[in-house]
Each structure stands twice: as C-alpha cells, then as structure tokens.
Interface confidence: low
Amino acid sequence: KESCDVQLYIKRQSEHSILAGDPFELECPVKYCANRPHVTWCKLNGTTCVKLEDRQTSWKEEKNISFFILHFEPVLPNDNGSYRCSANFQSNLIESHSTTLYVTDVKSASERPSKDEMASRPWLLYS
C-alpha cells in the first residue's frame, strides 16, 4: 500500500544559478494523498530558517505531484542563499533539504562563487 505520509522532494545539496533581474520560480515538490498540507518557505540565516511570510507563493498541481512555488519577480542580489520548504501535516512538521540560489548580479557581471569560496565565506549565503 502506498504511504500517505507527506513527502518533500527537494534533493540534498540542490542548487540553482540565476540572474538578478530575471523572474524565477523556486519549486518545492510535495507529495500528499488526501488533504494538501500547509507548506511554507523559509530562508536560512545561520542555524535558523526565517519564514518568508510576505513573499508571493502559489500551488501548481500535476497528476502525481504538486509544487509549492516561491516566486521571485524579479530576482534580487540579496535573494542569494539557501532556502527550505516545510509542510505542516497532522501536527507534524516535515522539512525539506535546503536548496541554494546563486544569484549573479548582472551589473557587476560577477561569476557564481565556487563551492570552495562558499565554504570559506559562508556569509555570501546570507547577504
């Protein structure tokens, strides 16, 4: 029998390279059976994840899975960082793996920092 637990299908260490000024949709793939769970996005700030309450979000329903989408219209340089979605279902909180956005500011034409740079300069994630 198929499990009816809510599942969040963000892959571990997933990342996206995006341009400042472009629109972007960050998807949280959600699998559920009956009641759609309450899903939220948050942005990592150190060890805490700050809820993104005032950002535009929407649901996209596919046949076998749904997507809770965080809209960036447009992407801003300070959108750089790591995000996580979480689902509240039957009093359980299920958290996804984090997904990282690497925002390239077109004006400065800077390249995406390398993983080594990100490791040595973690504040880049929260700028």
């Epitope: 759609r36 309450h38 899903v39 939220t40 809820k51 309450e53 005032d54 950002r55 535009q56 979000t57 929407s58 649901w59 509240n88 009093s91 909180l93």
Partner: antibody
Framework: EVQLVESGGGVIRPGGSLRLSCAAS????????MSWVRQAPGKGLEWVSG????????GYAASVKGRFTISRDNAKNSLYLQMNSLRAEDSALYYC????????????????????WGQGTTVTVSS | DIQMTQSPSSLSASVGDRVTITCRAS??????LAWYQQKPEKAPKSLIY???SLQSGVPSRFSGSGSGTDFTLTISSLQPEDFATYYC?????????FGQGTKVEIK
C-alpha cells in the same frame, strides 16, 4: 487533541468594549493563521477578522473595521479580539477558528478556509 | 465583496435520500470553496475544501463539485446525523464570505 476555547463574552452596553480570548492547544499555534467568525442569533456565519501566523497581516470585515482589533500572543498560544464602540448588531456568538492554507497565491489571511473551530463565546450588546 | 447564494434555503428529506445543495458565487472563485456543517448549539465543522476535497474524517457519502461560480454539495445517502445546516464559504478573495445556509430537516 486540537482544541480552541473562547472566553470573554458577556453583556455590555452600546458603546462599550470587550476583549475576547481564544486559548489554543494540541497544535503548533504559530504555524497557523487564525480567524474570528460570528453568528447572530438565528442567523448565518460572518467572518469578522483574521490574522497571520506572526501578527504581521490582519484583515477585517467592513462592518467592524476601525472598531475591532485582532491580535495574538504566540508565547501564550492565544488569540484576542478587542471590540470597541460596540453596537446592538454586534450581538452574536463569536467563534475562534484555525486557518488552513487550501488556496491560491500568497499565503495571507484571506486565502484560507477554517478547519478547526472553538465552541464560541456569546456577546450581547444591549441597553 | 463576493456574494454567495445557497439554494434551497431549507429542504425536507428522509433517511437514505440523496440530497443536493447548490452554492453560487457572484463572480468566479476558481475552486476555492469550502463547505461546513453546523448542528444546533454546536460549532461549525469543516466538511469539504477546494470545492471537492473531503476533510479528514468526513464520511465518503459527502461530496463536492463545481468550479468558477457554481458549486454543489451532495449527500449520497442521508443519515440521521446529517440533519443540520450547511454553509458554503469562498476564500478566493478578501473578505471571506459565507452563503446564508441551507437547513436540512427531517421529512
């Protein structure tokens, strides 16, 4: 068990004030928006006011705007409705209800249905 | 504000009957409609959300359908505990608004 218990109702003269409280238990209070819904004797349901998880967004029915104030204290798992300048037409059974995100767009106070209700507290405005 | 109009306002039915209640929105609300059941002296109970999704724990004899402006709540085989007042509510736009209610009485 998920539970909402309202208190603070009573008999008050027109122009007076009352503060309703709603004590929540059995769920993570600050994961949810909350609403007040009222029902005048022998009448239907009327949404009065709503508030998001952290109090950053509030909304009011036109009939109470400027007179009622919704607030919450997440540390106390409590929701409040401060009612000023009360009128005879405010006489009703006031229900506290938990909001659940079932809808489109930004998760804000008006994109929710109500999934859990308290038993209500009665407000009578009479001279 | 969006006006929600339910019909009929009341109906009489017998145990085992199929009962249909309709709800019409004054403008399109996609599928963002909920149904609630309220028994005398009790708080409302959530039955259906998103027009057709059954709330957890609600018997399968309840079903909802519709989108846009026209919606239906159906009770496939009325049970004694189903005699109550039913309300629809839109949550597509601010402020949330309810229908006036449909009272289901025993014939």
């Amino acid at each position: 068990e998920v539970q909402l218990v309202e208190s603070g109702g009573g008999v008050i003269r027109p122009g007076g004030s009352l503060r309703l409280s709603c004590a929540a238990s059995g769920f993570t209070f600050d994961d949810y928006g909350m609403s007040w819904v009222r029902q005048a004797p022998g009448k239907g349901l009327e949404w009065v006011s709503g508030i998001n998880w952290n109090g950053g967004s509030t909304g009011y029915a036109a009939s109470v705007k400027g007179r009622f104030t919704i607030s919450r204290d997440n540390a106390k798992n409590s929701l409040y409705l401060q009612m000023n300048s009360l009128r005879a037409e405010d006489s009703a059974l006031y229900y506290c209800a938990r909001d659940y995100y079932y809808g489109p767009g930004s998760p804000n106070y008006f994109y929710y249905a109500m999934d859990v209700w308290g038993q209500g507290t009665t407000v009578t405005v009479s001279s | 504000d969006i006006q929600m109009t339910q019909s009929p306002s009341s109906l009489s039915a017998s145990v085992g009957d199929r009962v249909t209640i309709t709800c019409r929105a004054s403008q399109g609300i996609s599928s963002w409609l909920a149904w609630y059941q309220q028994k005398p002296e009790k708080a409302p109970k959530s039955l259906i959300y998103a027009a057709s999704s059954l709330q957890s724990g609600v018997p399968s004899r309840f079903s909802g359908s519709g989108s846009g402006t026209d919606f239906t709540l159906t009770i496939s085989s009325l049970q004694p505990e189903d005699f109550a007042t039913y309300y629809c509510q839109q949550y597509n736009s601010y402020p949330r608004t309810f229908g006036q209610g449909t009272k289901v009485e025993i014939k």
